[in-house]
Amino acid sequence: LPAQVAFTPYAPEPGSTCRLREYYDQTAQMCCSKCSPGQHAKVFCTKTSDTVCDSCEDSTYTQLWNWVPECLSCGSRCSSDQVETQACTREQNRICTCRPGWYCALSKQEGCRLCAPLRKCRPGFGVARPGTETSDVVCKPCAPGTFSNTTSSTDICRPHQICNVVAIPGNASMDAVCTSTSPTRSMAPGAVHLPQPVSTRSQHTQPTPEPSTAPSTSFLLPMGPSPPAEGSTGD
């Protein structure tokens, strides 16, 4: 029979591969059927009988066509600093990712093995590089003429306001305070109302996190603990 119409199990022609969704069984020396995702090989094929497949039991899975004797165990439940983004089913493993405000310090094949809180930049320091799903926030000291008065994982250094007459000069952790008889300017909600400066600074939007890539399909080696960067709080 031509290979296209042979039924499994069959002996392949010398130099030929098995066909779609088949594997070569070394013991039987035959091409045999694989089991579909969500199943495993309950009984391996012989020269006269094909693979017998069975469904994966609860909390186990196979994601690929296979001839494994047992399904894989789903990963343990997600920890409190994680969210379950994919449930454990017969065809897929559970995937845990870090909840907002955390990043993945140690990836696994899919999802995250270990989450860590995003670094917070203390007053006098602003966010130089935002955190992503897989990288921590990087803080930098506020340059002359800029300040940050918050402890935050998102706030950047903002320019001091420019005054006609300076009451209190700004520094890295505080805005300048102006002296003026002009009416007070309207501020952003929650901001302290200060006397009107000569020119109001433009609103500075927070940097948006750069898009992060999907978790690596290779296992990452765990790295030793690193000290917090300057200007961060070990929160």
Epitope: A3, Q4, P12, G15, S16, T17, R19, L20, R21, K34, L64, W65
Partner: antibody, heavy 119, light 107 residues
Framework: QVQLVQSGAEVKKPGASVKVSCKAS????????INWVRQATGQGLEWIGW????????QFNENFQGRVTMTRNTSISTAYMELSSLRSEDTAVYYC????????????WGQGTTVTVSS | DIQMTQSPSSLSASVGDRVTITCRAS??????LNWYQQKPGKAPKLLIY???KLHSGVPSRFSGSGSGTDFTLTISSLQPEDFATYYC?????????FGGGTKLEIK
């Protein structure tokens, strides 16, 4: 990144043979089938066959059986497709493509090699 | 061999349109239906496999549906880069076979 790079264009006379190469990079060459697919000018796509680089075993479309030879050199991650007894209707662009044998798709393609058969 | 028939063979549409291309197999192919996009002078690119699974990097405006013998590729809102020729391909039985293609042109 994962890519397949093919050899350059060929012009052959009827009855001759042509051998096209396909160099893989960015993945483990021996773990995926390399398929060959051709496309005549302005026409659709036609599957020729595949080679499994790990052992060199092949699977062919019966329309090409006896005229096509597929080989590989694992040390340089390169697959070859040789088509013999060429005729004018073999004039086409020949593509190599990485294949998935469970779902029968081609996820990475070479840039194509134009083979012209003309007397 | 399994014959794959695409319709229409050509189609004119505008940016923003919703477009549907159909593919019919001469016999049951379960869900083993793949879709490709090809631009002139370029190799085909895999869009969708196993009827509806989106290949990595493919925009979510592409979707696939159907089962058995009748399948559809839908582009929810056409973008300028979507004007190309689309091919279906069955992955159920050897030999692997392709549809004749649907050329999507700008109206």
């Amino acid at each position: 990144q994962v890519q397949l790079v093919q050899s350059g264009a060929e012009v052959k006379k009827p009855g001759a043979s042509v051998k096209v190469s396909c160099k893989a990079s960015g993945y483990t060459f021996i773990t995926y089938d390399i398929n060959w697919v051709r496309q005549a000018t302005g026409q659709g796509l036609e599957w020729i066959g595949w080679i499994y680089p790990r052992d060199g075993n092949t699977q062919f479309n019966e329309n090409f059986q006896g005229r096509v030879t597929m080989t590989r050199n694992t040390s340089i991650s390169t697959a070859y497709m040789e088509l013999s007894s060429l005729r004018s209707e073999d004039t086409a662009v020949y593509y190599c493509a990485r294949g998935d044998r469970d779902y029968g798709y081609f996820d990475v393609w070479g840039q194509g090699t134009t083979v012209t058969v003309s007397s | 061999d399994i014959q794959m028939t695409q319709s229409p063979s050509s189609l004119s549409a505008s940016v923003g349109d919703r477009v549907t291309i159909t593919c019919r197999a001469s016999q049951d192919i379960s869900n083993y239906l793949n879709w490709y996009q090809q631009k002139p002078g370029k190799a085909p690119k895999l869009l969708i496999y196993f009827k509806s699974k989106l290949h990595s990097g493919v925009p979510s405006r592409f979707s696939g549906s159907g089962s058995g013998t009748d399948f559809t590729l839908t582009i929810s809102s056409l973008q300028p880069e979507d004007f190309a020729t689309y091919y279906c391909q069955q992955g159920n039985t050897l030999p692997l076979t392709f549809g004749g293609g649907t050329k999507l042109e700008i109206k």
